[in-house]
């Protein structure tokens, strides 16, 4: 990894605990201001592998609401608007970091947690293996 | 929102600061142990809207490495393996939380940051509007 020279103005929070506990400012800085506001807007409907979005809420997690994609079809939509079952609609998954209240119900104490979320769906061509 | 009864065993970190600063244990708990290990494995190659993955590294961010998807084609791959330019390969984007060292170069002090990442690509059929 890259070694970062320590800033002398850092808060004095010597690490007596293992696993390491750090201070985190929850006032979120949003770096998306210059990004295109449309984002994935209506892709869930217009994709050849469309998906539905399901709300997953957990008050013990931060963020408490996460949207999960579920592919609508087993196959993909063809040029005629029909489902082509020779293709597969599959979820694109991503590991994300969330904060889990630990101990439970504590407002100011969290643990980092990695969770896998489905962000949307894509259409894949399966590799066909002929069994002898 | 949902009101959570406070656990009496919570660390005593009364909120003198605004914006709110909390304690976070960086020993990551991975909840993905039971998930399918393949994930989006080779979807980036087999999708009808394939993508390349680009490494984005920033030592002042946690996680320091994030992979960004860039769609390979403007159009989508058709049944013959050719690019169909009547369709669009588009990135599926997601807002994720990361930790940004603040003040810079500090090992134990962070601020939550929201960034937009492209996770993969999907193929969309545009609605065609005829301009008068």
């Amino acid at each position: 990894g890259i070694t970062i020279p320590r800033n002398p103005g850092c808060p004095n929070s010597e690490d007596k605990n293992f696993p390491r506990t750090v201070m985190v400012n929850l006032n979120i800085h949003n770096r998306n201001t210059n990004t295109n506001p449309k984002r994935s807007s209506d892709y869930y409907n217009r994709s050849t592998s469309p998906w539905n979005l399901h709300r997953n809420e957990d008050p013990e997690r931060y963020p408490s609401v996460i949207w999960e994609a579920k592919c609508r079809h087993l196959g993909c939509i063809n040029a005629d608007g029909n489902v082509d079952y020779h293709m597969n609609s599959v979820p694109i998954q991503q590991e994300i970091l969330v904060l889990r209240r630990e101990p439970p119900h504590c407002p100011n104490s969290f643990r980092l947690e990695k969770i896998l979320v489905s962000v949307g769906c894509t259409c894949v061509t399966p590799i066909v293996h002929h069994v002898a | 929102g949902i009101t959570i009864p406070r656990n009496p065993g919570c660390p005593n970190s009364e909120d003198k600061n605004f914006p709110r600063t909390v304690m976070v244990n960086l020993n990551i708990h991975n909840r993905n142990t039971n998930t399918n290990p393949k994930r989006s494995s080779d979807y980036y190659n087999r999708s009808t809207s394939p993508w390349n993955l680009h490494r984005n590294e920033d030592p002042e961010r946690y996680p320091s490495v994030i992979w960004e998807a860039k769609c390979r084609h403007l159009g989508c791959i058709n049944a013959d393996g050719n690019v169909d330019y009547h369709m669009n390969s588009v990135p599926i984007q997601q807002e994720i939380l990361v930790l940004r060292r603040e003040p810079p170069h500090c090992p134990n002090s962070f601020r939550l940051e929201k960034i937009l990442v492209s996770v993969g690509c999907t193929c969309v059929t545009p609605i065609v509007h005829h301009v008068a």
């Epitope: 295109n36 506001p37 449309k38 984002r39 994935s40 807007s41 209506d42 892709y43 217009r46 | 860039k70 403007l74 669009n88 588009v90 969309v124 545009p126 609605i127 065609v128 509007h129 301009v131």
Partner: nanobody
Framework: EVQLVESRGGLVQAGGSLRLSCAAS????????MRWFRQAPGKEREFVAG????????YYADSVKGRFTMSADNAKNTVYLQMNSLKPEDTAVYYC???????????LGQGTQVTVSS
């Protein structure tokens, strides 16, 4: 509402050149890509060339590669199609298209006639 202003086509001799332009305007929209399509009598509309707005990458149909060049002026939401070494089989109505809304909506121009005589 998106408007498209396409330049006039014309009649050219085989081996000659022609430049088409197309400007997108109207309201606030974010361009995803711009393309040229063409349709010859009795045939389906086919892709000619395209440009991705963010990356600036250009794409061409095999039939025009090396002869046609597409370029863009992003600030003006305008694209150009420089057509060289024209052939009679390039005769068609050429349509400009702009994709907005992240690629979910396509606005197709009225088209301009290009005729290549032998």
């Amino acid at each position: 509402e998106v408007q498209l202003v396409e330049s006039r086509g014309g009649l050219v001799q085989a081996g000659g050149s022609l430049r088409l332009s197309c400007a997108a305007s109207g309201g606030t929209f974010s361009v995803f890509a711009m393309r040229w399509f063409r349709q010859a009598p009795g045939k389906e509309r086919e892709f000619v060339a395209g440009i991705s707005w963010t990356g600036g990458t250009t794409y061409y149909a095999d039939s025009v590669k090396g002869r046609f060049t597409m370029s863009a002026d992003n600030a003006k939401n305008t694209v150009y199609l420089q057509m060289n070494s024209l052939k009679p089989e390039d005769t068609a109505v050429y349509y400009c298209a702009v994709d907005v809304g992240g690629g979910s909506d396509r606005y197709l121009g009225q088209g301009t006639q290009v005729t290549v005589s032998s």
